[in-house]
């Protein structure tokens, strides 16, 4: 049988049938259903939702739907001993206390089990001391404090505004600076867009709203107690002292009403420049400590949260492939939320649900995909990508041999302006071609393609007439698949206009106000953006699972490898004298990139010409495409980050959310001028160039003719 016969109807018709079956009204209905109560990881409510999804996916027609459970380390506030921060006077009396909970949104006043704002995995403690304002607590902010302003954070409690980088990096930086506690707050400059009302009258953050979130530095480890292996029934667990990535100092988040009370008293140094000023009516002085009359007052933290090994549940659905059942295309997104999850994650989970329903409908009509499609509803993403990582650890041998692609499906929207895509270069052409076939939902682009509106609103900085596609970083469930296992990955969602909205993420992120009504009233009343995201995610899965030749273009990898090599070379060339002194050369890397480019070009020519009716040759060519991403994996991992194994991309060491190219070289060069042993530091740069050059060359050779 040819592959088309095996899947009954022609591929073009299949795709249209699949896309036509996706309905905005269903996504809306599913979102409502998923957001009526909290679904915090490790709770009974989230277990019940897992069973509901399992049941519905079975009804939709999947071949099998199983729950995969793990016992992982989670973190919860103490119900009887709440967390808070106080200002204390010289007698130790608490003269101000931060709020213990967010005022509930209208209609939700009687909902139980709303977890109060907390920083997951904070240790317990009651530190007291002077406050230092550290801006966003980025690496460069601490450099400015320590090196320019001569401010020592040792023994201080630092207050940092959310935004710009992952909160776990902020805490790590504060720890390294010697702080004894961290207060995180949402500044209106970052979480209150001008001209928009606060919730419930608009989509802005009210003063009592607070962002929850984990503060781990796992670097891809998954469950902190079982790094590298699944947290199953017979797991060996590390002691808490040896757990991966746990913070060592108390941390707590607050809203801007409470932050105002702390920041308005700050003394010490003026802020170094306007980039350190937010929008509160306070001087943004850095400290240390309070000013003048308030100088004897201190800040005290009261943190009583506990870490507990708790059972979590992934839902794994399978739609068996008709021709290549041992090749897996995975669509996964998480199900657990901090509270109601109106955007994160349920706007994504509702889209996955509708994609499953559409695939199920086709299957009931006798169709099957060429390759197996796996659908996943991950648990405990908010606690460090735990569900996805444990499942991938349990199934790593299968995944590294059979994994074709992973498409992530967290929040479908973070705005309603245009599409945002982050993916492997292998998927660039797939995304371009797909979006050219989809209708734009944007006002003013009626009858135009999604590609056209996306390109107009978010143009590529390098190539005119093309849209921006970003590097994959982390902070979501694709991490283990891409950064550890080397499975081609991508993600898509609708986003804000980054030009006019400079706030970080969306204002109500991880707050109690992230409700169904937030989406239905303010972001996407017609659910047209959700539908578009369903079409993009679903369409990518469809093509990856059903196209005869995998829709990967290795030539696009060649282009970005040259760009990344140029970029890292220019960073290194900021130190021309040292490069000369230590004989640092990038020739091997540029040579490997040139070889990759030539071999990729030849491979692409062969791909056009080979006999697609020969199943052995077809499988061979597809395997070369599938394994190309895998070829960029270094089994030894990056220095001090063994689970980040991709040599071309890794989450930035300074911001987990951002992707860094040639991360090994980048980290070796970072702040190299301050290293105590320059010879050793430049030796590491040379070693990392060697690793990168070897890896690119080795990857190129996987595309050569096999004999």
């Amino acid at each position: 049988k040819s592959s088309n016969e095996a899947t009954n109807i022609t591929p073009k018709h299949n795709m249209k049938a699949f896309l036509d079956e996706l309905k905005a009204e269903n996504i809306k209905k599913f979102l409502y259903n998923f957001t009526q109560i909290p679904h915090l990881a490790g709770t009974e409510q989230n277990f019940q939702l897992a069973k509901q999804i399992q049941s519905q996916w079975k009804e939709f027609g999947l071949d099998s739907v199983e729950l995969a459970h793990y016992d992982v380390l989670l973190s919860y506030p103490n119900k009887t001993h709440p967390n808070y921060i106080s200002i204390i006077n010289e007698d130790g009396n608490e003269i101000f206390n931060t709020s213990l909970f967010e005022p509930p949104p209208p209609g939700y006043e009687n909902v139980s089990d709303i977890v109060p704002p907390f920083s997951a995995f904070s240790p317990q403690g009651m530190p007291e001391g002077d406050l230092v304002y550290v801006n966003y607590a980025r690496t460069e902010d601490f450099f400015k404090l320590e090196r320019d302003m001569k401010i020592n954070c040792s023994g201080k409690i630092v207050i940092a505004r959310y935004g710009k980088v992952f909160r776990g990096n902020k805490v790590k930086n504060a720890q390294l600076a010697g702080a004894k506690g961290v207060i995180l707050y949402s500044d209106p400059a970052d979480y209150f867009a001008p001209g928009v009302k606060s919730y419930p009258d608009g989509w802005n953050l009210p003063g009592g709203g607070v962002q929850r979130g984990n503060i781990l530095n796992l670097n891809g480890a998954g469950d902190p107690l079982t790094p590298g292996y699944p947290a199953n029934e017979y797991a060996y667990r590390r002691g808490i002292a040896e757990a991966v990535g746990l913070p060592s100092i108390p941390v707590h988040p607050i809203g801007y009403y409470d932050a105002q009370k702390l920041l308005e008293k700050m003394g010490g140094s003026a802020p170094p420049d306007s980039s350190w000023r937010g929008s509160l009516k306070v001087p943004y002085n850095v400290g240390p400590g309070f000013t003048g009359n308030f100088s004897t007052q201190k800040v005290k933290m009261h943190i009583h949260s506990t870490n507990e090994v708790t059972r979590i549940y992934n839902v794994i659905g399978t739609l068996r492939g008709a021709v290549e059942p041992d090749r897996y295309v995975i669509l996964g997104g998480h199900r657990d939320s901090w509270v109601f999850g109106g955007i994160d994650p349920q706007s994504g989970a509702a889209v996955v649900h509708e994609i499953v329903r559409s695939f199920g409908t086709l299957k009931k009509e006798g169709w099957r995909p060429r390759r197996t499609i796996l659908f996943a509803s991950w648990d405990a993403e908010e606690f460090g990508l735990l569900g996805s990582t444990e499942w991938a650890e349990e199934n790593s041998r299968l995944l590294q041999e059979r994994g074709v692609a992973y498409i992530n499906a967290d929040s479908s929207i973070e705005g309603n302006y245009t599409l945002r895509v982050d993916c492997t270069p292998l998927m660039y052409s797939l995304v371009h071609n797909l979006t050219k076939e989809l209708k734009s939902p944007d006002e003013g682009f009626e009858g135009k393609s999604l590609y056209e509106s996306w390109t107009k609103k978010s143009p590529s900085p390098e190539f005119s007439g093309m849209p921006r596609i970003s590097k994959l970083g982390s902070g979501n469930d694709f991490e283990v698949f891409f950064q550890r296992l080397g499975i081609a990955s991508g993600r898509a969602r609708y986003t804000k206009n980054w030009e006019t909205n400079k706030f970080s993420g969306y204002p109500l992120y991880h707050s109690v106000y992230e409700t169904y009504e937030l989406v239905e009233k303010f972001y996407d009343p017609m659910f047209k953006y959700h539908l578009t995201v369903a079409q993009v995610r679903g369409g990518m899965v469809f093509e990856l699972a059903n196209s005869i030749v995998l829709p990967f273009d290795c030539r696009d990898y060649a282009v970005v490898l040259r760009k990344y090599a140029d970029k890292i070379y220019s960073i290194s060339m900021k130190h021309p004298q040292e490069m000369k002194t230590y004989s640092v050369s990038f020739d091997s890397l540029f040579s490997a990139v040139k070889n990759f480019t030539e071999i990729a070009s030849k491979f692409s020519e062969r791909l056009q010409d080979f006999d697609k009716s020969n199943p052995i040759v077809l499988r061979m060519m597809n395997d070369q495409l599938m394994f190309l991403e895998r070829a960029f994996i270094d089994p030894l991992g990056l220095p001090d980050r063994p689970f980040y194994r991709h040599v071309i991309y890794a989450p930035s060491s300074h911001n987990k959310y951002a992707g860094e190219s040639f991360p090994g070289i980048y980290d070796a060069l970072f702040d190299i001028e301050s290293k105590v042993d320059p010879s050793k530091a430049w030796g590491e740069v040379k070693r990392q160039i060697y690793v990168a050059a070897f890896t690119v060359q080795a990857a190129a050779e996987t595309l050569s003719e096999v004999a």
Epitope: E140, K144, G268, P272, D273, S274, S275, G292, S295
Partner: antibody
Framework: EFQLVQSGAEVKKPGASVKVSCKAS????????MNWVRQAPGQRLEWMGL????????DYNQKFKGRVTLTVDQSATTAYMELSSLRSEDTAVYYC?????????WGQGTLVTVSS | DIQMTQSPSSLSASVGDRVTITCKAS??????VAWYQQKPGKVPKLLIY???TRHTGVPSRFSGSGSGTDFTLTISSLQPEDVATYYC?????????FGQGTKLEIK
């Protein structure tokens, strides 16, 4: 080796503008703010403003009421101070100084003479 | 703007003398005060920051103290190379402001 090297002395007529440059080397230019401080003959030091080279954003001393403009050229690792509508009392030595709030590193200074 | 007023405007002392220069802020600046030394024809050099912390390489005979509005720079044993003008600077509020300077000479 760390250095801030400023452009040479200037003589300007009242009402004209002057642009002084400050070439930085030996450190990561975008990591540190650049300040401009002037000193009229026999007078105190006077802070004019600062620029964050990473973002190109500047903060000014309001005393100069829009007469001063601070810019940077990242690729040339150079900071610039332009002062317009010059008057005789602007005759001073103009310094660039690296730092935030504190000035541990200074350029050698540029004498600007305003005379008709 | 915060005014910084130094006293005396000038002083003359002998080698080995203990010399004290004071600086008064027009409003409280906590300890956000720095002291600079400027030798004739040279650029200013940072001596003290955070009112009392000596900058790298500054001789131990230089010390600073104070908080709020009153600050002092002390040279415990005056040396010939200390002939210079000394400036205080506040960095608690923008605009950053300097004192008018104290010119120190050797008798």
């Amino acid at each position: 080796e760390f250095q801030l090297v400023q452009s040479g002395a200037e003589v300007k007529k009242p009402g004209a503008s002057v642009k002084v440059s400050c070439k930085a080397s030996g450190y990561s230019f975008t990591d540190h703010n650049m300040n401009w401080v002037r000193q009229a003959p026999g007078q105190r030091l006077e802070w004019m403003g600062l620029i964050n080279p990473n973002y190109g954003t500047a903060d000014y001393n309001q005393k100069f009421k829009g007469r001063v403009t601070l810019t940077v050229d990242q690729s040339a690792t150079t900071a610039y101070m332009e002062l317009s509508s010059l008057r005789s009392e602007d005759t001073a030595v103009y310094y660039c100084a690296r730092g935030s709030s504190l000035f541990a590193y200074w350029g050698q200074g540029t004498l600007v003479t305003v005379s008709s | 703007d915060i005014q910084m007023t130094q006293s005396p405007s000038s002083l003359s002392a002998s080698v080995g003398d203990r010399v004290t220069i004071t600086c008064k802020a027009s409003q409280g600046v906590d300890t956000a005060v720095a002291w600079y030394q400027q030798k004739p024809g040279k650029v200013p050099k940072l001596l003290i920051y955070w009112a009392s912390t000596r900058h790298t390489g500054v001789p131990s005979r230089f010390s600073g103290s104070g908080s709020g509005t009153d600050f002092t720079l002390t040279i415990s044993s005056l040396q010939p190379e200390d002939v210079a003008t000394y400036y205080c600077q506040q960095y608690s509020r923008y605009p950053l402001t300097f004192g008018q300077g104290t010119k120190l000479e050797i008798k």
